[in-house]
Amino acid sequence: EDWQCPRTPYAASRDFDVKYVVPSFSAGGLVQAMVTYEGDRNESAVFVAIRNRLHVLGPDLKSVQSLATGPAGDPGCQTCAACGPGPHGPPGDTDTKVLVLDPALPALVSCGSSLQGRCFLHDLEPQGTAVHLAAPACLFSAHHNRPDDCPDCVASPLGTRVTVVEQGQASYFYVASSLDAAVAASFSPRSVSIRRLKADASGFAPGFVALSVLPKHLVSYSIEYVHSFHTGAFVYFLTVQPASVTDDPSALHTRLARLSATEPELGDYRELVLDCRFAPKRRRRGAPEGGQPYPVLRVAHSAPVGAQLATELSIAEGQEVLFGVFVTGKDGGPGVGPNSVVCAFPIDLLDTLIDEGVERCCESPVHPGLRRGLDFFQSPSFCPNPPGLEALSPNTSCRHFPLLVSSSFSRVDLFNGLLGPVQVTALYVTRLDNVTVAHMGTMDGRILQVELVRSLNYLLYVSNFSLGDSGQPVQRDVSRLGDHLLFASGDQVFQVPIQGPGCRHFLTCGRCLRAWHFMGCGWCGNMCGQQKECPGSWQQDHCPPKLTEFHPHSGPLRGSTRLTLCGSNFYLHPSGLVPEGTHQVTVGQSPCRPLPKDSSKLRPVPRKDFVEEFECELEPLGTQAVGPTNVSLTVTNMPPGKHFRVDGTSVLRGFSFMEPVLIAVQPLFGPRAGGTCLTLEGQSLSVGTSRAVLVNGTECLLARVSEGQLLCATPPGATVASVPLSLQVGGAQVPGSWTFQYRED
């Protein structure tokens, strides 16, 4: 019989229900914005905005200072007071829409939904390792702001993204705001603008450059700005917006907008459609060619990538890549595939595609009918003409006007659909050693830290744990402070180590020591932990073998048993070859001689499952007693594997030595032609791994084996005669003298 060890699912080596408690801060209201500051002198801060309040936290998430930012018109509003005596507009709550650092001196800038979306500048003062905010400056000059032209009206109540760029010594605010007709009329913010902060912090310089959704499209064409960032020579905005100005406004797609970070102008404003798809390895019937589209960006982050992912993306290590989590629609509801997919867009490739798009529009020969696009911002035109013009005039350049690149950038889900039902709501990507890790927050308040790698059919988890008991969605914006990431969920801010919250979710020594080096996991006798958790017994260099099962569970006291051991950390080498003298198995007092691995039986084990098998021949010693005993596997002097060496002993109860007894055989005669069905009755007849009924030395073919009975068909006899009949278990004869009589047919 060929018994095989049962597979252990890979998931059994970890437990994602393990509770981790990470430092947190209760903000007293839904967290609306969060930003971190790290100074040159080891001082740092976390700024957390909720409705009508701005909290300053130390690096330990303890409150250092709190500032009232609203309601506007309330005498207790500390920021409002910086604008001098009012009234400054209708009273109302202040929802923070923008919270950014101006690196120049440095200072924190906050902009809210009240007071026409104006901003406040707070100088930072280090106090030890904490930071305080100076009295706010009101970035608003009454004399140059009008309802129709307001350089100091920055934030839209519908949402605003800001990236601050230093050019020379000036701070330029790259601002992108969602608009509708009502907001555009009352606030006069712009969709996209570049505003220079005046040196005296009296507001933003008038005459700034801007693009805005044209009034006729404001009702139907809404742009959501999901993310903004600055890398290299450009600032990028990521948007979700209707795919067409004229078609169904609910048919959305994702775009990347690129602006120059070196020149505060919008002539080289470019947009590119980002296309993210789920393309399963085996396409279902009826599934779309090229994969299922996931057109709506939910969250994004750009980061330099580690060596392994860089190789898979065919780019150099350390190059910047934009990662986006995409869903099928605004509600992110389930489709055929996973709820969320993650696509990677290398920035250099994005830039190349944009530049090629400009060439197609502006270099002869231009393909007839190629549109400049962005008809929601500017008058329609065909390339190479400027917006609204029939032809280029000699003193204008095709390149100096905004353009939608005619081709999209298409990528497929890095995770091959493995996120399944998970709805990702937050994303931050880091490079740790040569590994690229996606730190993701979810709709149900969990954090997933997963290696970004393309080629696998399972997820490589650093961790997967619940932030708290509320189960509230993790919010979009994530900040980094030193070796920690700050996630917000509901009214809480949580501080999660980039290396993961701990190691206790790894249940086996092997899984523990195979964890990434940066996690600092070690084995503590019977659990996986970090050194601080168990300083006495913590080690990272070896694992004992682990027996989980064996077969058979009993064997004869006389004769041999081929014992198959199941478990992990037997070999560390896929071949399962064992150097001489490294593995010692004893059953009770008896040794079990290791058997060479039968190479014909070697079969690939997918990483999703794991099991190791070890076979040995058990020959009980003469002193061995009948009854239950332990199986013990000791491994010593094994050469080290990639992650650790195997060393130690594993003991498992449940093996019994038994003495088979043959009590009766019937019938005791049969035809010489053979085929008589013999029934052998007794006790412990099924022990061990081999048994044979011999009729005159020839094997009687076993038809059924049970503890108390054997059935076999007699072989043909040479002559009519009485012949010896014996039972061997494990190659040893069971006591008793029996004969079988062959008769004429």
Epitope: K198, A199, D200, S202
Partner: antibody, heavy 120, light 107 residues
Framework: EVQLQQSGPELVKPGASMKISCKAS????????MNWVKQSHGKKLEWIGL????????IYNQKFKGKATLTVDKSSSTAYMELLSLTSEDSAVYYC?????????????WGQGASVTVSS | DILLTQSPAILSVSPGERVSFSCRAS??????IHWYQQRTNGSPRLLIK???ESISGIPSRFSGSGSGTDFTLSINSVESEDIADYYC?????????FGAGTKLEVK
């Protein structure tokens, strides 16, 4: 009463470096940025840069980067400007002036000036 | 850098007369202009901030106006103690810059 007391006149050799001090009193030193202004003999005023005593943040006029280094000592409410590799072009009166970098404020108090003569 | 051009270089007036100093910016700076007076061997003294805002302790005969690129400092009745150099300074953009100054002489 707000006062900015600067160190006395200096005669220094070409190639040398020197440090001018500006001791503030009568107000919260960390509450205002400290600006430094050069007035050469042609009466021209040139802004050198500022330092925020609050956090040590500095902004320099590109023209003076590498020539002037601004520092503060919060414990003594004193701002310093070090002038490096002096030449005859650096002979001038140097002023410190406080400025609240906020809408609505200008350089409202100035030191008495520190005269620097660079000569061999 | 923003260039501030002051004119004239020298103004000569009689006591009691009204006098105006001009400062023109090379680009629009809103009202981020400030005026200083510097008497002989003295330090600059702030007279007017943000183009037209008065400073406590400064006589009311000093006033300012303008926005964008053109700014004016006025003394509505000159006194002998007003003999000094007058400088404009912009705080709109880095680096902060000063005008070359106008010298006021009293006949």
């Amino acid at each position: 009463e707000v006062q900015l007391q600067q160190s006395g006149p200096e005669l220094v050799k070409p190639g040398a470096s020197m440090k001018i001090s500006c001791k503030a009193s009568g107000y919260s030193f960390t509450g205002y940025t400290m600006n430094w202004v050069k007035q050469s003999h042609g009466k021209k005023l040139e802004w050198i840069g500022l330092i925020n005593p609050y956090n040590g943040g500095t902004i320099y006029n590109q023209k003076f980067k590498g020539k002037a280094t601004l520092t503060v000592d919060k414990s003594s409410s004193t701002a310093y400007m070090e002038l490096l590799s002096l030449t005859s072009e650096d002979s001038a009166v140097y002023y410190c002036a406080r400025w609240l970098r906020r809408g609505g404020y200008a350089m409202d108090y100035w030191g008495q000036g520190a005269s620097v003569t660079v000569s061999s | 850098d923003i260039l501030l051009t002051q004119s004239p270089a020298i103004l000569s007036v009689s006591p009691g007369e009204r006098v105006s100093f001009s400062c023109r910016a090379s680009q629009s700076i809103g009202t981020s202009i400030h005026w200083y007076q510097q008497r002989t061997n003295g330090s600059p003294r702030l007279l007017i901030k943000f183009a037209s805002e008065s400073i406590s302790g400064i006589p009311s005969r000093f006033s300012g106006s303008g926005s964008g690129t053109d700014f004016t400092l006025s003394i509505n009745s000159v006194e002998s103690e007003d003999i000094a150099d007058y400088y404009c300074q912009q705080s709109d953009s880095w680096p902060l810059t000063f005008g070359a100054g106008t010298k006021l002489e009293v006949k």
